[in-house]
Amino acid sequence: AILGRSETQECLFFNANWEKDRTNQTGVEPCYGDKDKRRHCFATWKNISGSIEIVKQGCWLDDINCYDRTDCVEKKDSPEVYFCCCEGNMCNEKFSYFPEMEVTQPTSNPVTPKP
């Protein structure tokens, strides 16, 4: 059973390492894949002394942990590299960090990407 599934056909693309990887730095990435597989968008970033540095954004292969996520939100507490994935076109355009501890109340740190 799949409720309210949104198709992902394209994602915001960004690569901080674009020169070395020989890719574009930014743009829109069409998401390709097998017909029977779902596609997602993702974002990875770092927080260097309070400054947000985007590492990569783009398409992400079929991954059950991305199912039913309409927003790109990292919820892990204090990761080295922040990661989020989501379903829906360009859903990785905005991403945010809402750490959730097991017991304590979640706090929020919304992020506006500035590639």
């Epitope: 409720l3 079929d62 059950i64 039913d68």
Partner: antibody, heavy 118, light 111 residues
């Protein structure tokens, strides 16, 4: 420390029902997909069911479709497997597993034994 | 119906190297199937060894490595030890909510 503790197994007659539970601790349960995997006596591992973070998407192996229902209660950090119309071939140890990004099983419970016999 | 195939059994001498493989009937295994490998000793829950083709799980010794060999996923154990004697399972993520386990390989460490 991540812990997954299954319960609810036991002896049941063919055609009967059981509900398995998996109590999760040591991680933020609502952030991860979960799965059930079983192992019949002397046999290999078999994926049974999976469920997305919200519970909005559920998946089953063909042999249990229409008989088993997976669900989760994110407020109670608990995964469930409702098993109806049980058959002898459902006899197995049932493991719950946490699923990490790239869809692999990163932590496993110790399992609970379900025996279907008259 | 997807069937994932593994060698039913394999033997290795202590200190030797063994490569277990994982293929399927519908074509080639690629990294997009996120192959993962699990070790299980009798009466115990499985232990995660390798995920995403070649990433070792936390605490797994570097004697264990994963790769794609030709059209199959592979688990290589170098410098095999007595306590590597176990069952090894590969899993392929087929996407759209479906996983398929291989039948498992029973590894015997001789001697």
């Amino acid at each position: 420390e991540v812990q997954l503790l299954e319960s609810g197994g036991g002896l049941v007659q063919p055609g009967g029902s059981l509900r398995l539970s998996c109590a999760a601790s040591g991680f933020t349960f609502r952030n991860y997909a979960m799965a059930w995997v079983r192992q019949a006596p002397g046999k290999g591992l078999e994926w049974v069911s999976g469920i997305s973070v919200t519970g909005g998407s559920t998946f089953y192996t063909d042999s249990v479709k229409g008989r088993f229902t997976v669900s989760r209660d994110n407020s109670r950090n608990t995964l469930y497997l409702q098993m109806n119309s049980l058959r002898a071939e459902d006899t197995a140890v049932y493991y719950c597993a946490k699923v990490y990004y790239t869809s692999f099983f990163d932590y496993w419970g110790q399992g609970t034994l379900v025996t279907v016999s008259s | 119906q997807t069937v994932v195939t593994q060698e039913p059994s394999f033997s290795v001498s202590p200190g030797g190297t063994v490569t277990l493989t994982c293929g399927f009937n519908s074509g080639s295994v690629s990294t997009s199937y996120y192959p993962s490998w699990y070790q299980q000793t009798p009466g115990q829950a499985p232990r995660t060894l390798i995920y995403n083709t070649n990433t070792r799980s936390s605490g797994v010794p570097d004697r264990f490595s994963g790769s794609i060999l030709g059209n199959k996923a592979a688990l290589t154990i170098t410098g095999a030890q007595a306590d590597d004697e176990s069952d090894y399972y590969c899993v392929l993520w087929m996407g759209s909510g479906i996983w398929v386990f291989g039948g498992g390989t029973k590894l015997t460490v001789l001697g």
